[in-house]
Structures are given as C-alpha cells and as structure tokens.
Interface confidence: low
Amino acid sequence: MDLWQLLLTLALAGSSDAFSGSEATAAILSRAPWSLQSVNPGLKTNSSKEPKFTKCRSPERETFSCHWTDEVHHGTKNLGPIQLFYTRRNTQEWTQEWKECPDYVSAGENSCYFNSSFTSIWIPYCIKLTSNGGTVDEKCFSVDEIVQPDPPIALNWTLLNVSLTGIHADIQVRWEAPRNADIQKGWMVLEYELQYKEVNETKWKMMDPILTTSVPVYSLKVDKEYEVRVRSKQRNSGNYGEFSEVLYVTLPQMSQFTCEEDFYFPWLLIIIFGIFGLTVMLFVFLFSKQQRIKMLILPPVPVPKIKGIDPDLLKEGKLEEVNTILAIHDSYKPEFHSDDSWVEFIELDIDEPDEKTEESDTDRLLSSDHEKSHSNLGVKDGDSGRTSCCEPDILETDFNANDIHEGTSEVAQPQRLKGEADLLCLDQKNQNNSPYHDACPATQQPSVIQAEKNKPQPLPTEGAESTHQAAHIQLSNPSSLSNIDFYAQVSDITPAGSVVLSPGQKNKAGMSQCDMHPEMVSLCQENFLMDNAYFCEADAKKCIPVAPHIKVESHIQPSLNQEDIYITTESLTTAAGRPGTGEHVPGSEMPVPDYTSIHIVQSPQGLILNATALPLPDKEFLSSCGYVSTDQLNKIMP
C-alpha cells in the first residue's frame, strides 16, 4: 500500500520524533483522572480477562511510564505476547506511524517506560495494547495530564505555641519536595495537600492546598498522638501523587490540670471586644459632646485688631503708645471700613436645639442678671484666639480636614444642622466670574469657590480703588445668612481707658447686576448674599426687613494696606425651618449694632459692649450678638 510505503519512508528519514501523525484511537475518558482508571467499559467488546491499561504516570514531566493488567494471561496460551505501541500526535495530523514500547523493563512488569528521549511534554500521545495483532486497549493523553509527583520527603514538625490553658497546641509541619521534581528551574510548580488525624481516628482532615513546603497546624489537642501526611501535584494539571510517609506528632501534657472536654476561655476575644466597646463609647461620647468639648479646648477668643496700630504694641500692652497714636488721629473716627484687612475671622458653630438650653462659655461671658438669653444664643464662637487667618502658617498647615468641606457651600446643604464652618476666600477681583455676578438673587443659588486642595487662598481686595462704594445688600433665605459684616472695630481709646468701637457693614461679595426692586425686601427672601458674616440665630429668627440700597461710606486711608479678606460661610438652617419669621415691617432699616464703649470687663477674655447707635427691634439682638473677645485688648485695659 502506498500509505505504508510513505510511512516507512518518513520513519526511515529520521522523522520519528518530528513526525507526529496519529491514529484516531481516542478513548472517551471521564473527567476524573483517567490515569487512575481503566478504559471505559463501554469501549470494550473483549472480556474483562483481557489486558487493559491501569495507569500512566509522569513523576516530573520529563519521563513517563504506562502500566497494564495481565491477570490470567500467564496461564493462557491462546493469546500472543502483549505489546504496547505508541504514536505522538500533532492535532492537525491524521496518518501516523505506530512504534513499539522502547523499554518494557525499567518500570517493572507489565509496563512501558518512556525516558526523556521519548517524552515530549507538548505533544499528545496515543498508546495501544495489542495481542496477536489485535488491539485490546488504547488511550490518548498529553504528558501534563498524567503528571503525578513522587511523595514529599523529610517531614518534620516543630512546636509553635501552647494555649493559655495548656489544652491545645499549634505546630509547624515542614517537608521537602521530591528529589526528582525540578522546582528550582520552575519546570514543576507543585502544590501540596496536608492531611492529619488522631491516631485512633479513621477520617483524615484535609487542609487547603498550599504552594509552600511548610504549614502551621492549629489547635491540636495536647496528650494526643497525630498522624500527618503530605502529597503533591503539579499545579493546574495532573493528579495528586502518593502520600508521603506518615509523620507522627505527639504533644506531651504541659499544664498542671487536664480537662475531659475542651475548655475555651476566650481571653483575646474578651480583650478585643472590650477595647472595641470602649472605643465605640468614647466616639459616641466625643461626638455627642463635640461642640462643648471644642468650646472647652478652644475657648471663644475672637481677636479684633486695631486699625493702623502695630499688633505688637497691643501684645506688649504699651497703653501709652497706643493712646498717643490714637490721640494724634483725633479726627479719625471713620465709619467702619468693612474692607479692612485686620479683621479676624471667627468660626461659627450652630448648636443642636437641645444644646441651647445649657449655659455655654459664651453665655457666661455675656451674662448679666438682667440680660441673659440662653435660648437665643445660637452661634458659638469657635475662634481659638490664634493669629490672623491671613498669615501663611495657618494657611498652609493649620486647617483641620473637618473644617473644610468637600467643595460644597453650606448653603447647598440645608440638611446639615451643625458642623464646622467653611473657611473660604472670595477674590473680589474675580467677582465678575462668580456665580453671583450674573445671576438674579431671586433665582441663583449661592455657591462658593472651593480653594484648590481645600485650602483657603488669600486674595487681595479692591477696596482702594473706590472711596465711595455702595453696598448693594443682596437678600437670601435664612439658610444662607452667613455673609454679613457685624464686626466690632476698635476705633479709639479714650484717655480714661475706655475702648471705643465702631460697627461696620459692607457687602464685599460680587454685586448683582440684576436690579434690586425698589420695594422693601424681607430677609427671608432667597439668595441673601453677604460675606464676612457673623450672624446670630436670634437675628435670623427675626427676618428683619431691609431697604434694598444702603450706602456705607468707605473712607480709605492710603496709608493702610489692603490685605486679604477671609469670609466664613456657615449654614444657619435652624433658623430657616422656623415658622413665623417672615413678617414684613415696612419702612424699617437694617439694624446695625454700634458698639461705642466697653460696658463691663468680666474677664481677661471678655468685653461686654453697650450698643447705643441704633434703635433695635428687639433687645435680644444685642444680647445674642453684642460681644467681642480679645487676648490683646486685655493687656492694655486697666
């Protein structure tokens, strides 16, 4: 036949290893490792007495051997000699040549051994058993599928630790990979399975497969003997090899007492849960008392600075020099320069309603027998009395993450009833770009420019460009009553030692281009937009009507530096939600408290001020907002 001549020619041409044509002797094998099974019974027409393959195995991916049964063949003469033929397949090839087993001896009786010269890891093999020229069994496989490593060797163990009660112990079991497994070069990557049991038990406990040659075994009972064994397999292919020799582990009794049953005293668990519980309680306490704790740690010390006077003079308490400076400018009684650069910012915190019934430090500073207003003091002074926020060290390093919110105005968060005040800077040079510039106050929701990296950016003002600047008061709902100047400015010190203070009120934010309506507008209207505001909850409750155009003369001294302006914005939504706050009082003007002299010096940190300049619609306006605290002024007071 032409085909046989072709095959013979190819074989003689030395292509036996390269040529991997194949015979379609494909056996259907179950998903279980076929190398441990006989051929599917459905494949056979011959009797079960005939020889059949039992297993093919490669211990190290470099050689393999196949074994078959030959139970009754020795005693029967009708069957010829059993021969094994093999062929190597290329998946594209159909025709092939069959070659006889290269070594019937090395792997033992009824076996064929393929050394490394006959083993190719990537090419599939087909093998068949023949007797008297007829095929009695056949299998096909790739070498990777039949990898079954030799057992791990040199098992040993060491004690890791013993439980507090002395009843249980942990051990570390170690072993070595089989000698013939080429682990170092990565030709074989073995995974190991450790099994252990008590000597008198029958069922082995299996641990998860691991890639290392050691593993801890936990919670073994002391005074018991254990058997440990390990087996390995080629990772991602092949089957587990034989188990190693059994390692016996005996754990001697180490405690003075023994227990029949397991006795667990979970000290660690108790400690962990205890610490966890204490931590939770501490957090709950801290969060519930957050504002009071803050007031204790950072008492309210806003620091107004005297315009035109070196703060070092104030710090050193040189009263004469201060008086001299102020006396020279006897005519200098300015209406408040709201664009003054020495204004200290004060962080505002809104208390929960239930906290307002308790007397705060601020209350104590302001209190007198006839003038206490606990329930109306809705804004706490969180200023720590540190240096001006315009100074670089605070700019760069002193902002707490909690004090700066993620790029959103408090106005846009009406659900937030309390929290830290956002510290923001509005660039008056850039006000034309701000959302307030083009938007009509009736429709535009105020928003704030978030400084890069959540840090306030100092921005210069343009106050020097105009000496007469109209402050167009834009109006908002009470939830945004956070942008109005209510600063007490020290404008003079009398020879008697009284400090004379002037009010200031001016809108430093971008002026709306939308025309203000001539009629009176209530404070409860949308988009009240004033910056640098410290506005009390008590004031917010009034919804005081305002005339739309209030002119404030700004007498700018050329000698004064126009420094950076910082504003704070804080949600005052507790006022926003209150009913009955929208009553209009036609014709009334915006009350501006005019603090003209010190009324009482209660403590080195607190000054109570008399308000005499303007009639107020309600006395509580003063009681809730009329105070200034300073750690500089106390040094120059008698």
Partner: antibody, heavy 125, light 108 residues
C-alpha cells in the same frame, strides 16, 4: 472566521483533467490538514484525499489512487486537487474540509470541523 | 478498508420524537467516529466527534454513544430544523477515512 472556498469545478469529458482549488482563511494553513470529500448526486459522502501542509504527507482513497494528486501552496493558503483521467463516476460535488484532532475533556477525535460550500465536477461526453 | 454500515437508510419521524441512528464498523475503530448532518445543497456539519463528544455550538439534544463497534446517534426531541441526512465517519488510521451511506430523516 474559518473559511474554505472551492473553485475550478465544471464540465469535463471523460479522460480529461481538471484542477480544483481550495482557498483557506481564518486559520494557520501551514499547520493544517486538508481533505477532499466528494458526493455523487443522490449518494453519500466519499473521502477522496488528504494532505498535511506541514509534513507534506498525503493519502488517497483506493478509487482515485494514481489519477488524483493533492498538493498545497502555503504561501497562497490554498490546497489543490489535480484530477486526471476523469471518469463518469467521478461526477460529484467536491468539498474541501479541514481535518482536525479535536480534544476536549480527555476525549480525542479526528473529524472535519470546517467545510467549503462545494464545487460541482461533471464528467460527461 | 473499514466499512461503516449505517441504518436505517431513511426514517420518518415527527417533531418531538426521539430518533436513533446506528452505525456499525466492520472492525474495531476505537472511538474514532464522528457524526455529520447535511441538508440538501449544503456542506455537512460536524455534530459529534470521538463517538460521544458534542461539538461546540451543537444543541444538546444530539448525543452519541459507543458499544464496541456499534455507534449510535440520538436526537432526543426532533426539531423541524433537524430534518436532514446524517452520516457517520470513522477516522481510525492508517486506513482510509470512510463514511456510512447516510440516513435520511424525513417528516412523517
């Protein structure tokens, strides 16, 4: 996408010759085995010939030995069946098919997994 | 050469019927048997290879089995698109590849 396209069929007189082509695409032709299978009108399938592009080995059915020659041009990804001394009984639709050892879950099987659409060869006087 | 004897040569069945086609090899071919489906004017399509392995994309209602030299193709529930001619084929080299004569499945 694997595609096999036959061409070259037609009417030929007995004793004449014809060359069929099978243009392959979508797989590595250089390592492939191409078979020709024919089907006479109203009859069953009959395997004709086979070539291994890689090894260059060929095999033929007894009925066409000595008359048909199978070849392949790997540069063109094309297999050819040169048919000489055609007889009337060679009239059939000739299909080229890719032969492949399919391996899945320990099961091997050689089969024709992709076929061309066929080309009709009519041998008639 | 190995002969593949297919039976029946034709059969009539209804949609939903269980259909069985058998193929007997004249000698042992191991499991090297494939089954194909062919519709008129079209090329055959592979259904089963290695006697019982379902080729990818083939509906699971098709199955194959082997008992010695007898091979069976079963369609568990005949569908309208299953009416066609079915062929068995052995690839037990080094013999020439041979097909069965085909079984035509017709609508009853």
């Amino acid at each position: 996408e694997v595609q096999l396209v036959e061409s070259g069929g037609g009417l030929v007189q007995p004793g004449g010759s014809l060359r069929l082509s099978c243009a392959a695409s979508g797989f590595n032709f250089s390592y492939s085995s191409i078979h020709w299978v024919r089907q006479a009108p109203g009859k069953g399938l009959e395997w004709v010939a086979y070539i291994s592009s890689y090894y260059g080995s060929t095999s033929y059915a007894d009925s066409v030995k000595g008359r048909f020659t199978i070849s392949a041009d790997t540069s063109k990804n094309t297999a050819y069946l040169q048919m000489n001394s055609l007889r009337a009984e060679d009239t059939a639709v000739y299909y080229c098919a890719r032969g492949y050892w399919i391996y899945y879950q320990y099961a091997w099987g050689y089969a024709f997994d992709y076929w061309g659409q066929g080309t009709l060869v009519t041998v008639s006087s | 050469d190995i002969q593949m004897t297919q039976s029946p040569s034709s059969l009539s069945a209804s949609v939903g019927d269980r259909v069985t086609i058998t193929c007997r090899a004249s000698q042992s071919v191991s499991s090297a048997v494939a089954w194909y489906q062919q519709k008129p004017g079209k090329a055959p399509k592979l259904l089963i290879y290695s006697a019982s392995s379902l080729y990818s994309g083939v509906p699971s209602r098709f199955s194959g089995s082997r008992s010695g030299t007898d091979f069976t193709l079963t369609i568990s529930s005949l569908q309208p698109e299953d009416f066609a001619t079915y062929y068995c084929q052995q690839s037990y080299g080094p013999y020439p590849l041979t097909f069965g004569q085909g079984t035509k499945v017709e609508i009853k």
